[in-house]
């Protein structure tokens, strides 16, 4: 209460208004001035926030009323000002004064869980007393006002697994829980104010308590026996089936590893990390005929087990897996991965080479048929016996690589092949011969015993030991006694003069027959002609000038030949233009006897067998139109080239450099002459006939010299060869 010192002034109380009053208005209190004598001349005024809206004053009496429901939780204090005015004068009777209206609390707010939804995770099998979560409710009422905001927590749902501390809201585990039985629990918590006394308000919340997994379950196979099948044809690494163990745990705790307790040589088990299945893998190929089923024992263990949980994983779960091997119709199997046979060259037709053997690995043991892929030299019978069908020449082919196939009689799809290597063994069937062509020169004034040539020999036969050649002169040349031979016994010999003085006019050339014998059994001897030119030497006795002159002569001759070829080409061109001109007029057929396009089949015979297949037709007319002729070589040059190529062919085949040169020449022809034939394929003629019994069909192999070649016989072949006869006839005339 307040009163002025001079006993005059305001009189009031500090006012309290209960919140949430349901009446239209609530009397707060009365402002009163003790100067008010009740004469109805004082007017009371209320000022400040809430005056006239929340609080109204009866201006006659000073009674203050709250006309709105108040909420302490919204506003707990109002500070207002009061005035008292004498209405007769309109002046304030007393100074304006401030007073307080406090809103007193009632228990009108229930406890609220502001942090909901609550969710907690706790490991399964946690011991009693383990803290799960703390829940907290908030009561908006005045904590200082009695028990309005004093809370007690209790569990409405969740016993007997959980308990709550009444004053703190701490939830604890009260009994062990197994996630595999139930993995989550809804716990309902009630918070009551007024410390639970009558008239208390309450609020509830739900707590979702999830049990996290611990590895308290081992994986267990659902089946005692799994039946799987595998084809005997399955390659290693094949997945042949799946086995499955079940683990009631989840996540990492359910990860498992499978293993095989026995026979881990043939099978393996890997874990599919996605599905946790065990995939049985074939580690080694199986053979139905060898073993048609397997019984293996598999076990499964968890991958991650903590030390304190080992008690749950004492014994690993095991199961049996029966793997049935499925029989497959397998191709025949040769007894050996390859065969190596030897046979003497020149063995007659039908000679035994060797025998191969294949069997059907299947139970039914089908009979086997054998065949040789593309061979005209060997054949094989149903027993696997290989024989020759043609004589063999080691010098043509020292080795044969055959592919022999074995086919099941009742299922020709089942086929196997084996490589067979036939080595042709040497017999001494080739006499030694000069290793090169020798042109020797001797001065007219040469003295006796002068070395004029060192000679060496080659033998196409294979030598088990080193070849040894014996050199001698023929009986006639020995009698002649102009020259003698000395065997150096190192497979070379020297030719020496056996007299003094020679005459260029009387006898310009000597032809010496040199006999060369090998050390084979039986020994073979060849006669080789050595040409010795008599030379008009200089004072120093040098044959060089003689050799140079010969070289110039030969060059001169070559120039003549080239000129002759050029003239021939010009004649041919003239002839072609004449024909084209005639064609323009009357369009005659090329061959009046038969009007169709004429093509020649050029056969290649240096390949063993398959000659019938190498038939490619070439348009002769197109071939004739070549305007650039290759440089003609003399007999000896060409022969030497062919010999060198022939030697190479015995080793690896035609030298690629030779063909590169040939192709480049052809490209040059094509670039120079737009009328050159299309260069679509390459036919190799350098080796023509070398593999056949008949020998070479080429005129290059002829013993006749270039100058002696006569092509008149072409005229006798009829109209088809008329142009060819004309071409070669003209060329020969030009040369002559």
């Amino acid at each position: 209460d307040y009163k002025d010192d001079d006993d005059k002034g305001w009189v009031w109380n500090q006012f309290f208004v209960p919140e949430e009053m349901n009446t239209t208005s609530h009397h707060v209190g009365r402002l009163r001035s003790d100067l008010d004598n009740g004469n109805n001349s004082f007017q009371y005024k209320l000022l400040g926030a809430g005056a006239g809206s929340t609080f109204i004053i009866d201006e006659r009496t000073g009674d203050i009323y709250a006309i709105e429901k108040l909420d302490r939780e919204e506003r707990s204090l109002y500070i207002l000002r009061a005035q008292v005015i004498d209405i007769t004068t309109g002046r304030a009777v007393e100074p304006e004064s401030e007073f307080v209206i406090k809103v007193s609390d009632i228990n009108d707010n229930e406890p609220k869980f502001l942090d909901e939804p609550y969710e907690a995770i706790v490991p399964e099998m946690s011991p009693e007393g383990t803290l799960v979560i703390q829940v907290t409710a908030t009561d908006a009422d005045d904590p200082a006002s009695g028990n309005n905001a004093r809370l007690l927590y209790s569990l409405l749902q969740g016993q007997p697994y959980f308990s709550i501390e009444p004053t703190t809201g701490v939830i604890r585990i009260s009994s062990k829980m197994d996630r595999e039985l139930q993995d989550e629990y809804w716990v309902i918590i009630q918070a009551k104010d007024m410390i639970g006394l009558p008239g208390a308000l309450s609020g509830t919340t739900s707590v979702l308590i999830k049990l996290s997994d611990v590895n308290d379950n081992k994986p267990i196979f659902k089946e005692r026996l799994y039946r799987l099948t595998v084809s005997e044809s399955a390659p290693t690494g094949t997945s042949i089936g799946r086995i499955m163990a079940y683990d009631n745990d989840i996540g990492e705790n359910a990860e498992m590893d499978y293993s095989i307790e026995d026979d881990s040589q043939t099978f393996d088990i890997i874990t599919n990390n996605e599905t946790q299945e065990g995939i049985v893998i074939l580690k080694k190929k199986v053979d139905f005929e060898h073993q048609n089923h397997y019984l293996i024992r598999a076990n499964v263990k968890n991958r991650h087990v903590a030390e304190h949980l080992m008690e749950y994983h004492v014994e690993a779960s095991t199961t049996f897996v029966r793997v049935q091997v499925e029989d497959e119709d397998e191709p025949p199997v040769f007894l050996l991965p390859y065969y190596l046979f030897e046979i003497l060259e020149e063995s007659p037709h039908g000679s035994f080479v060797g025998m191969v053997s294949a069997t059907d690995p299947d139970q039914r043991k089908s009979p086997i048929r054998y065949s040789i892929t593309r061979s005209k030299v060997f054949s094989i019978d149903d027993n696997g016996t290989i024989i020759t069908t043609n004589p063999l020449d080691r010098e043509i082919s020292a080795w044969y690589n055959l592919s022999i196939t074995a086919t099941e009689k009742y299922n020709v799809q089942q086929i196997s092949a084996v490589p067979v290597y036939v080595q042709v063994l040497n017999i001494n069937d080739h006499a030694p011969e000069f290793s090169e062509y020798y042109d020797s020169y001797v001065c007219e004034n040469a003295g006796s015993g002068q070395v004029i040539q060192t000679i060496s020999a080659v033998d196409r036969d294979e030598s088990v030991e080193d070849h040894h050649f014996y050199f001698n002169l023929s009986v006639e040349d020995t009698k002649n006694s102009s020259f003698i031979i000395i065997d150096n016994e190192d497979n070379t010999a020297v030719i020496l003069t056996n007299r003094t003085g020679f005459s260029l006019q009387e006898e310009p050339v000597f032809y010496i027959s040199v006999l060369i014998a090998d050390n084979g059994i039986p020994s073979l001897t060849s006669t080789n002609t050595l040409t010795i030119h008599i030379c008009d030497c200089d004072d120093y006795g040098s044959t060089q000038t003689c050799r140079d002159k010969d070289l110039l002569l030969s060059m001169g001759f070559r120039t003549e030949v080239i000129l002759a070829i050029l003239i021939s080409i010009m004649i041919i061109f003239g002839f072609i233009f004449l024909i084209l001109g005639l064609k323009q007029r009357r369009k005659p057929t090329l061959f009046p006897e038969k009007g169709e396009d004429f093509r020649e089949n050029i056969f290649r015979y240096d390949d063993e067998g398959g000659g019938e297949e190498d038939t490619e037709a070439f348009d002769i007319v197109q071939l004739r139109s070549s305007t650039i002729m290759r440089e003609r070589k003399t007999r000896k040059t060409a022969a030497a080239e062919i010999r060198s190529l022939y030697r190479q062919s015995l080793q690896v085949g035609p030298d690629s450099a030779i063909f590169r040169k040939f192709i480049l020449e052809k490209l040059e022809e094509a670039n120079t002459d737009p009328c050159a034939p299309p260069f679509d394929s390459l036919q190799t003629y350098a080796f023509e006939g070398t593999g056949s019994l008949a020998g070479s069909l080429s005129s290059l192999g002829s013993a006749v010299s270039d100058q002696d070649e006569n092509y008149d016989y072409l005229n006798e072949l009829g109209p088809r060869f008329k142009r060819l006869a004309c071409m070669f006839g003209s060329a020969m005339q030009s040369n002559n």
């Epitope: 239209t24 006659r60 006309i67």
Partner: antibody
């Protein structure tokens, strides 16, 4: 224009409580002072008390112990309760309005109801 | 309480005449808070004058009030037939509000 209409039982037994209601129509009950006045048969007028719309009241000291005046702003009504009535309380009861709007002092009654006769008799 | 005494108790006059009604207070009425009412039989009182001299809305100007302190007068300058009724004075200067016992104005 504002009109007042009294209602209530015309007969009340002695010692019982007389209850009357005055309904304000044509205007709001807010911001005015509302009084009850009675007139015994053949006699003069007697002021019973007033109520302000906020609920503030002032009663005639001669009746204060037995009188309660209340207001229901939602219905635009105010009421009179007179307890422990006797035959002396038989009268014509009027409701009336102070003429001054939110006056700080009292004023004459500018609007009256037609009055309702209440007889106290057993 | 302030006691109001009205005189005469009954006044008999003819229409057209002047009527003067008196009201005396047992103590001074603060602020001249005195009102005059007219009541006809079977009707509620009707406010004529407030604040001792202020005519209420719709009241003919033949009605006038005067006085202060303790003595107050209501004058009807020229009586009309409808003016014959009972007239009450009321003070509202001090609680409780009190009324006079009334003056009956009757036609002679």
């Amino acid at each position: 224009q504002v009109q007042l209409q009294e209602s209530g039982p015309g007969l009340v037994k002695p010692s019982e409580t007389l209850s009357l209601t005055c309904t304000v129509s044509g205007g709001s009950i807010n911001s005015y002072y509302w009084s009850w006045i009675r007139q015994p048969p053949g006699k003069g007028l007697e002021w019973i008390g007033y109520i302000y719309y906020i609920g503030s009241t002032n009663y005639n000291p001669s009746l204060k112990s037995r009188v309660t005046i209340s207001v229901d702003t939602s219905k635009n009504q105010f009421s009179l309760k007179l307890s422990s009535v006797t035959a002396a309380d038989t009268a014509l009861y009027y409701c009336a309005r102070d003429s001054r709007y939110r006056s700080g002092w009292y004023d004459a009654f500018d609007i009256w109801g037609q009055g309702t006769m209440v007889t106290v008799s057993s | 309480d302030i006691v109001l005494t009205q005189s005469p108790g009954t006044l008999s006059l003819s229409p057209g005449e002047r009527a003067t009604l008196s009201c005396r207070a047992s103590q001074s009425v603060a602020g001249s808070y005195l009102a005059w009412y007219q009541q006809k039989p079977g009707q509620a009182p009707r406010l004529l004058i407030s604040g001792a001299s202020s005519r209420a809305t719709g009241i003919p100007d033949r009605f006038s009030g005067s006085g202060s302190g303790t003595d107050f007068t209501l004058t009807i300058s020229r009586l009309e037939p409808e003016d014959f009724a009972v007239y009450y004075c009321q003070q509202y200067g001090k609680s409780p509000i009190t009324f006079g016992q009334g003056t009956r104005l009757e036609m002679k």
